[in-house]
Each structure stands twice: as structure tokens, then as C-alpha cells.
């Protein structure tokens, strides 16, 4: 209209999706009577009547706003509920009297996008790619208006960089009118990026101001060629025979190349390939001294067939050889002396110890054990232990049995055995001496002899209990070149009154556990039946 003043800028009303917009008609009393107002929405420069106010009473017009409009503030404000992105437009109120004036309101709608969803390239990126490769994608769903995306690497924003960094973004409009932003980061990566942390950030605006949401941080699988190959041995430190040793090949490339482990043959000086397990690890179990030697690893890039060799690594499996004792089977007269000498080889310095077998008592620290004025009790086992003090658990031992010449010793001199008439009795008798004795019985029966050790013998006799046997008892006699000795077994009939509830009526004599060095009057460790009651 000629001469009409330029329209003032509309009032800005900002509101979040889903909430209520309060559209206040800003007409002054001079411009119009608020009890008689028409409200319009303007879309693509087309006005549509949406609401009428007459005498302060409101009435919605049929259409998209019919159910969402109401009057507030004594008719000065129009409330629009459940705001959607499609409501972002100009609304105007027009007063009818005294003359037609209008007031314009620009409704701005906002919605925060969902948390950005980042997905990393699941196949990884080679460092030698010819152009920027897809690193990760970022999706920000259901925002309004379109959020802005910023990509970060190690906390620093990434900028477009020709042939190095390219960010490609697009948006789609959902049926709700909200935007989904999709962005893909393409970059040329270097080996150092294997640990780089990438994330995307969405920047958006709300009525309350500017905001941002960050995705989780991701690392990208980066592929780079192997430059260095090396061997690693577990366990670290000194190795000993019997250990489980693992030799593995390591490389600084990703993915790891194909490996083979070789050992230098000491005679030919040629490298011979060793058999590794499925993981490419050479397992030596148990490790032996023959495993000592020079190992190296070869790595192949199967694409280029270029191979790399590791620095050789010397492996030392420490050992102690079999221990030798001389004399190996010593025999001595009572009162004489004996020198026992122990020898062994090792990859390390050795320490020797002599121990008494029966008691584990340390007799000597050193390879030589001197024994003087030998008594019969000195017979038995002596153990030489050769050990490497610097490697706990690395030791070998050798046992030597010293025999002292002497007539037989009996495990017991006499013993009472409870029997029942007509039972088959199992009797045993033990004796020791050097030379080893033989045992004979003074009654007929089935006898069997068992050698317990070079100086000790156990004889067992099965015999039927007869009245004569009860009368005479049983004797066992042990004899060798140097003499003889006898043990007596007295047989006593078992009365019912002599039995206790837990006693065994068929008990014979259990094998004595007395050692060859036990005195003849030593107590037996077998369970004895109670003494018979006295009969008056």
C-alpha cells in the first residue's frame, strides 16, 4: 500500500518441540480492541485464519490447529500446545476496531538431537591408502533445526584438509519433521593414529541457548607394515630344566605377520625351523639343556612376501647333571671309616650337601662326607644334593646306601600272639644285617621271604594253630655269615572274655614296622589285644 510504513520485525518466540507456545498479541489499545481479534498462520506467504476472538471468547477454525489452540491472559495470549517442527512459521493477530492493525510473531521451534551414535570402521584402515578412508560414521537423530557436527581426534577438532581429512554430512527429514544428521569422517591415517581417540560432537540450539552432545570415544584399527621383529622368552630370568618355556615372535606391524622360529644347529651352524603351536609360540615343556642355543625369528608379509629377521637370542636352560657318588655301594666293618665323594656338572656354580636319608639331617656342606668309627646304626641311606643357589629349585640328588657288616638283628625278641584253635595263623618276622640274613622257622608251614632292602628281610609263615603249636610256640631264626639270632612268638588262646567289642578275632601278627636299626626290645607299632584276665 503506497505510503504504508515498512513492517516491523516480528516478535521472536522460541519453544521446544512438544511444549506449549504462548503467542501474546502485542497490539496496543490504540491499535485495536483485543476483545475482537483474528489470528492467522502464515506459511509460504499464504495466510490462514486459525482462531477468532469475539467479546473475549475464543473459537478455533477448522484445520490443523483446531485441537491445539486456547486463549489465556484474559484473551491477550493464544496458547499453542504440542508444538511440532511444522509450527515454525509466522503467526499474526489482527485487531478489527477501530481500524485494522496486525502484530506478527515468529515462532522458532527447537529439539535437542539424540545422543550421537558413532560407529567405527570395523575393517580398519591401512596407512598406505591412496586417498582418505572412511574412519567412522556419526548419526544424530531427531533434532531440530539441523544440528552441526564437529569431529575430534585426541580432543582437537578436525578441519577439512585436502587429501588428508574429508567430512561428508547429509540430513534426512523424518515424518515428524525432525532432522537426522549423518556424517562420515574420511582421513588418511598414520601409524601413530593406532591409539588416537575419535569422537563426534553435535552442536544445537535450544531456547535456553547453545548446547552440545558428544559421542563415545572410539579407536580405529590401523594397519601398518612391520618394521621390526623380536623374540620374547617367558618366564623372564634364569631358566632351568623342567620349566615350561615359551618363545614367541613379536612384531611392530598390524596385523602381525606370519612368523617362523628357528634354532641354530650347533654342529652345522644352520638355522633349523622349530615347530610352533597354533598361536606361533614355541613351547619347550619340559625344557632340557639341549634346548639351549641361538634362536631367531623370521616374519613374512604374505602380501609382499618381504621377510624380516629378528636379532638372534641366546637361550640358556640351566641344568644339573646326574649326581655321581663314590663309592656307589659302600660296605664297611664296625669301627672303620668311610669317605663319600659327590660329583656333578652344571651350567652354573654348584653347592653340595650331604643329608641322612632317614632324618633329613644335614651332615655336611660340601661334596665330601667323612664318616669315622662307624657303628651299626650308621648303616642306611646318605643323600647328596647338588644345587644351584642362584636358581631356586634347580638341584639333583643321589642316594647311597651304606652297609655295616654284622650278624642279624631281630625286629623283636619275643612277642605274644592271640589265636584261636584251628585258625590259620599268619606270622611274620623281620631281621636285618649285612650280608642280608635269611630266615627259617622251627615249625612246618608255608613260608615266604621278602627283601625289604639290601640289609633287611621279612619272612611270613602261614600255619594252622594246633594244641602242639600252642604248647611249643614258634621261633624264627635269622642267620648270615657273621652269626644268627632268634625271635620267639608265644601263642595264647583267645577267650571270649578277653575280647573287646572292637577287637578282631582273627588277628594274627601284623608286619612289624621296626627298622633294621631298631633295638631288639623296641616296641612294635601294631595294635595289641588286651592282656587276659587273671583266673583265680
Amino acid at each position: 500500500v503506497p505510503g504504508e510504513a515498512e513492517q516491523p520485525a516480528p516478535e521472536l518466540v522460541e519453544v521446544e518441540v512438544g511444549s506449549t507456545a504462548l503467542l501474546k498479541c502485542g497490539l496496543s489499545q490504540s491499535q485495536g480492541n483485543l476483545s475482537h481479534v483474528d489470528w492467522f498462520s502464515v506459511h509460504k506467504e499464504k495466510r490462514t485464519l486459525i482462531f477468532r476472538v469475539r467479546q473475549g471468547q475464543g473459537q478455533s477454525e477448522p484445520g490443523e490447529y483446531e485441537q491445539r489452540l486456547s486463549l489465556q491472559d484474559r484473551g491477550a495470549t493464544l496458547a499453542l500446545t504440542q508444538v511440532t517442527p511444522q509450527d515454525e512459521r509466522i503467526f499474526l493477530c489482527q485487531g478489527k476496531r477501530p481500524r485494522s492493525q496486525e502484530y506478527r510473531i515468529q515462532l522458532r521451534v527447537y529439539k535437542a538431537p539424540e545422543e550421537p551414535n558413532i560407529q567405527v570402521n570395523p575393517l580398519g584402515i591401512p596407512v598406505n591408502s591412496k586417498e582418505p578412508e572412511e574412519v567412522a560414521t556419526c548419526v544424530g537423530r531427531n533434532g531440530y533445526p539441523i544440528p552441526q557436527v564437529i569431529w575430534y581426534k585426541n580432543g582437537r577438532p578436525l578441519k577439512e584438509e585436502k587429501n588428508r581429512v574429508h567430512i561428508q554430512s547429509s540430513q534426512t527429514v523424518e515424518s515428524s519433521g525432525l532432522y537426522t544428521l549423518q556424517s562420515i569422517l574420511k582421513a588418511q591415517l598414520v601409524k601413530e593414529d593406532k591409539d588416537a581417540q575419535f569422537y563426534c560432537e553435535l552442536n544445537y540450539r535450544l531456547p535456553s541457548g547453545n548446547h552440545m552432545k558428544e559421542s563415545r570415544e572410539v579407536t580405529v584399527p590401523v594397519f601398518y607394515p612391520t618394521e621390526k621383529v623380536w623374540l620374547e622368552v617367558e618366564p623372564v630370568g634364569m631358566l632351568k630344566e623342567g620349566d615350561r618355556v615359551e618363545i614367541r615372535c613379536l612384531a611392530d606391524g598390524n596385523p602381525p605377520p606370519h612368523f617362523s622360529i628357528s634354532k641354530q644347529n650347533p654342529s652345522t651352524r644352520e638355522a633349523e625351523e622349530e615347530t610352533t603351536n597354533d598361536n606361533g609360540v614355541l613351547v619347550l615343556e619340559p625344557a632340557r639343556k639341549e634346548h639351549s642355543g641361538r634362536y631367531e625369528c623370521q616374519a613374512w608379509n604374505l602380501d609382499t612376501m618381504i621377510s624380516l629377521l629378528s636379532e638372534p637370542q641366546e637361550l640358556l636352560v640351566n641344568y644339573v647333571s646326574d649326581v655321581r657318588v663314590s663309592p656307589a655301594a659302600p660296605e664297611r666293618q664296625e669301627g672303620s671309616s668311610l669317605t663319600l665323594t659327590c660329583e656333578a656338572e652344571s651350567s652354573q656354580d654348584l653347592e653340595f650337601q650331604w643329608l641322612r636319608e632317614e632324618t633329613d639331617q644335614v651332615l655336611e656342606r660340601g661334596p665330601v662326607l667323612q664318616l669315622h668309627d662307624l657303628k651299626r646304626e650308621a648303616g642306611g641311606g646318605y643323600r647328596c644334593v647338588a644345587s644351584v643357589p642362584s636358581i631356586p629349585g634347580l638341584n639333583r640328588t643321589q642316594l647311597v646306601k651304606l652297609a655295616i657288616f654284622g650278624p642279624p638283628w631281630m625286629a623283636f625278641k619275643e612277642r605274644k600272639v592271640w589265636v584261636k584253635e584251628n585258625m590259620v595263623l599268619n606270622l611274620s618276622c623281620e631281621a636285618s644285617g649285612h650280608p642280608r640274613p635269611t630266615i627259617s622257622w622251627n615249625v612246618n608251614g608255608t613260608a615266604s621271604e621278602q627283601d625289604q632292602d639290601p640289609q633287611r628281610v621279612l619272612s611270613t609263615l602261614n600255619v594252622l594253630v594246633t594244641p602242639e603249636l600252642l604248647e611249643t610256640g614258634v621261633e624264627c631264626t635269622a642267620s648270615n655269615d657273621l652269626g644268627k639270632n632268634t625271635s620267639i612268638l608265644f601263642l595264647e588262646l583267645v577267650n571270649l572274655t578277653t575280647l573287646t567289642p572292637d577287637s578282631n578275632t582273627t588277628t594274627g601278627l601284623s608286619t612289624s614296622t621296626a627298622s633294621p636299626h631298631t633295638r631288639a626290645n623296641s616296641t612294635s607299632t601294631e595294635r595289641k589285644l588286651p592282656e587276659p584276665e587273671s583266673r583265680g
Epitope: N117, Q119, L123, S129, S170
Partner: antibody, heavy 118, light 106 residues
């Protein structure tokens, strides 16, 4: 619209080499990566190989030494070769487009059944 | 390699039923998971990506949920055309598919 179509022999002999071609239309191979996925009769899907929009090639490590994937952008074709074929390689072979802003497959070819038999 | 295990391997249901199919990853894959539908003699078709986003053109009766190692595909009200085999696929590290769940008419 986006289409992918596999072509190649339906029958190969053991120890022979299989060559399959995937011809695409409706998109550019420099915008979307393409993968090959196979499915033995009555079995599950198995990813074989991929070529990215930038031309980087990727292989399933189970077949790596037998596979080669390449592309001819001017012909809109992706070629898969698989050497030393075995009867266990009998399957329907699909080529599939990787979605431009994600890592899943949004369009697939109809597949081609390859039988390995002497 | 990441293993994907689907359960059940087969399932009988009727039109109108609500159906859930589960997929378990052998390690955390965040939400790097897609669901596909395959009918006999046809190529797979993507239904869900990023664990819970519905692919354009797929009916809203299909929905996906879960993150980390446990995921679910739900069909809220089975339609006759939904009887097919369903596969989950991870794209967190390489690509691996589940063994499939065959959905049959009861």
C-alpha cells in the same frame, strides 16, 4: 534405483579358481563400498571380502591366501577371485552394498549359486 | 573373532503374535548390530541397523533393542509375510553373522 547383480560360473571343479563379477547401478563405487558374502546351502551367511569406496581391500582371514577383490569403477564392476576351490565352497555368493553412512549392507544382489564338484 | 549366537534357532508362531529373537555377542559391540530378514531363494534385507534404528521402508512393527552383548529383534504383531529366517550381524570388528532364526507358521 540401486541394483547389484552377480555373474560367473555355476559349476567349478575342485582346485580350480572361481571368478565372480558384481555389476552395480544406481550408485558409484567411489561413494559406497561393496562386500562379498556367501551362504552354503541351509547354512548361515559368511562375509568373505570387501572393497571400500577409496579402493582399500579387506579379506576374511579364514580365506585370505585364496582371495582377491578388485574393481573397475568405469565399468561399475567388482570382481572376486577365489583360488583352490573345494566342495565345501559350494554356496550362494552375494555382493552387497555398504550403506554410505554406516557399516551394514543396505542393498544386496540376488546371489549366484556356485557348485564345486568334479 | 567376535561370535554371534542367536536364540532360538527356530520358532513357531501365529499371525498376530508378538515375537522376540535374541542375539548374543561374544564381547561388547556397543550398538554395532544389524538385523536382516531372508526368505527362501532371496537375498537378505536389512530391517534394523545400529541396534535400534529402523531402516527406511520397513514396517514399524519391527523394532530392535539392546547394546553391549545382548540384543533383541521384536515383531509386535506377526503378519503372513514375516515368516522367514532372521539374521543378526555385528559390524564392530569385522563382520560376523548369527546362525539364523527360522520363524515358521504354527
Amino acid at each position: 534405483q540401486v541394483t547389484l547383480k552377480e555373474s560367473g560360473p555355476v559349476l567349478v571343479k575342485p582346485t580350480e579358481t572361481l571368478t565372480l563379477t558384481c555389476t552395480v547401478s544406481g550408485f558409484s563405487l567411489t561413494s559406497n563400498g561393496v562386500s562379498w558374502v556367501r551362504q552354503p546351502p541351509g547354512k548361515a551367511l559368511e562375509w568373505i571380502a570387501a572393497i571400500s569406496s577409496g579402493g582399500t581391500t579387506y579379506y576374511n582371514s579364514a580365506f585370505k591366501s585364496r582371495l582377491s577383490i578388485s574393481r573397475d569403477t568405469s565399468k561399475s564392476q567388482v570382481v572376486l577371485t577365489m583360488t583352490n576351490m573345494d566342495p565345501v565352497d559350494t554356496a550362494t555368493y552375494y555382493c552387497a552394498r555398504r550403506y554410505g553412512y554406516g557399516w551394514y549392507f543396505d542393498f544386496w544382489g540376488q546371489g549366484t549359486l556356485v557348485t564345486v564338484s568334479s | 573373532d567376535i561370535q554371534m549366537t542367536q536364540s532360538p534357532s527356530s520358532l513357531s508362531a501365529s499371525v498376530g503374535d508378538r515375537v522376540t529373537i535374541n542375539c548374543k555377542a561374544s564381547q561388547n559391540i556397543y550398538n554395532s548390530l544389524a538385523w536382516y530378514q531372508q526368505k527362501p531363494g532371496k537375498a537378505p534385507k536389512v530391517l534394523i541397523f545400529n541396534a535400534n534404528s529402523l531402516q527406511t521402508g520397513i514396517p514399524s512393527r519391527f523394532s530392535g533393542s539392546g547394546s553391549g552383548t545382548d540384543f533383541t529383534l521384536t515383531i509386535s504383531s506377526l503378519q503372513p509375510e514375516d515368516f522367514a529366517t532372521y539374521y543378526c550381524q555385528q559390524f564392530y570388528s569385522g563382520y560376523t553373522f548369527g546362525q539364523g532364526t527360522k520363524l515358521e507358521i504354527k
